[in-house]
Interface confidence: medium
């Protein structure tokens, strides 16, 4: 079965958009979007760091670190109100996402 | 075995602040989220508050919203639960509780401390 | 916040169901929470609906129909008999997500 011109594998993501704001000093805030063609019952999220069809289950409970987002290493720490979540590198680097 | 183990309890005074000290062994401390939850004389279980991994996040039940901060030390293994302005309704006991998972909610609590009691009175 | 029986019974070997509804967060489940006396700790019997911890007996499971969970105790012993508080978690933009626990379950066994 042949993709059409711009249409994505069953199973993968890509980057539709994405923005970076270094305004503020020590701190970089990214907003991306994705698109994503996810076999039936996944969705888009994120494995580590990338985008990725993930259990759709995952989204639904707001488990964000049952989808493994953080890079090999890192420290997953789900933000209690459940907006996001946290990855900590073994230097204590902090980077926080949120889903929107 | 998980062992958490509680301390700083007894007789306070209204309007003054207790600190309360959870020392938590038989498991990595640094990846589980950790709670507090009272139960005063007589009643139910009430939600204190938790505090993520890295002790950046925290979040607090409506009656000491405002009044109690929660923080950790994961070199020391330690969770500590500090309230001020206290009030006769603060009086109970005072339960540590590790999250099972990678968060802590009211379901998810897979081990308990022993307690520490509290008691608000002049 | 969670609604509970105040009470059950059950004879030795009988099969006891304590059920638990509401809380605004189906999807974290429920947890289930033995306490034997007033001023002993709690002890998990199961947390995130289905999970027991390993040094709880089989007899010991919950399910989750709805928004109903149910703790089932199939072949109830003496040692039992205590208070059983449900689990779960409520949202309000005052304070985001919260814990909240039903006010209890008494179960004698005769």
């Known amino acids: 079965q042949f993709l059409k011109e711009g249409q994505l594998a069953a199973g993968t993501c890509e980057i539709v958009t994405l923005d970076r704001d270094s305004s503020q000093p020590r701190r970089t805030i990214a907003r991306q979007t994705v698109k994503c063609s996810c076999f039936p019952g996944q969705i888009a999220g994120t494995t580590r760091a990338r985008p990725a069809c993930v259990d759709a289950r995952i989204i639904k409970t707001k488990q964000w670190c049952d989808m493994l987002p953080c890079l090999e290493g890192e420290g997953c720490d789900l933000l209690i109100n459940r907006s996001g979540w946290t990855c900590t590198q073994p230097g204590g680097r902090i980077k926080t996402t949120t889903v929107s | 075995a998980v062992t958490l183990d509680e301390s700083g309890g007894g007789l306070q005074t209204p309007g003054g602040a207790l600190s309360l000290v959870c020392k938590a062994s038989?498991?990595?401390?640094?990846?589980?989220?950790m709670g507090w939850v009272r139960q005063a004389p007589g009643k139910g279980l009430e939600w204190v508050g938790v505090?993520?991994?890295?002790?950046?996040?925290?979040s607090y039940g409506s009656a000491v919203k405002g009044r109690a901060t929660i923080s950790r030390d994961n070199g020391q293994s330690t969770v500590r639960l500090q309230l001020n302005n206290l009030r006769a309704e603060d009086t109970g006991t005072y339960f540590c509780?590790?999250?099972?998972?990678?968060?802590?909610?009211?379901?998810?609590?897979?081990?308990w401390g022993h307690g520490t009691e509290v008691i608000v009175s002049s | 916040a969670l609604t509970q029986p105040s009470s059950v019974s059950a004879n030795p070997g009988e099969t006891v169901k304590i059920t638990c509804s509401g809380g605004?967060?189906?999807?974290?489940?429920y947890g289930w929470y033995q306490q034997k006396s007033p001023s002993s700790a709690p002890l998990t019997v199961i947390?995130?609906?289905?999970k027991r911890p390993s040094d709880i007996p089989s007899r010991f499971s919950g399910s989750k129909s709805g928004s109903t969970h149910t703790l089932t105790i199939t072949g109830v012993q003496a040692e039992d008999e205590a208070v059983y508080f449900c689990?779960?978690?409520?949202?309000?933009?005052?304070?985001?997500?919260?814990?909240?626990f039903g006010a209890g379950t008494t179960l004698t066994v005769l």
């Open positions: 509780a590790k999250g099972s998972a990678s968060y802590i909610t009211a379901a998810t609590i897979d081990a």
């Open positions: 038989g498991f990595t401390f640094s990846s589980y989220q």
């Open positions: 505090i993520n991994k890295s002790g950046s996040d925290t």
């Open positions: 605004g967060s189906s999807g974290y489940g």
């Open positions: 947390y995130w609906n289905d």
């Open positions: 689990g779960n978690d409520d949202y309000s933009s005052d304070s985001g997500y919260v814990g909240v």
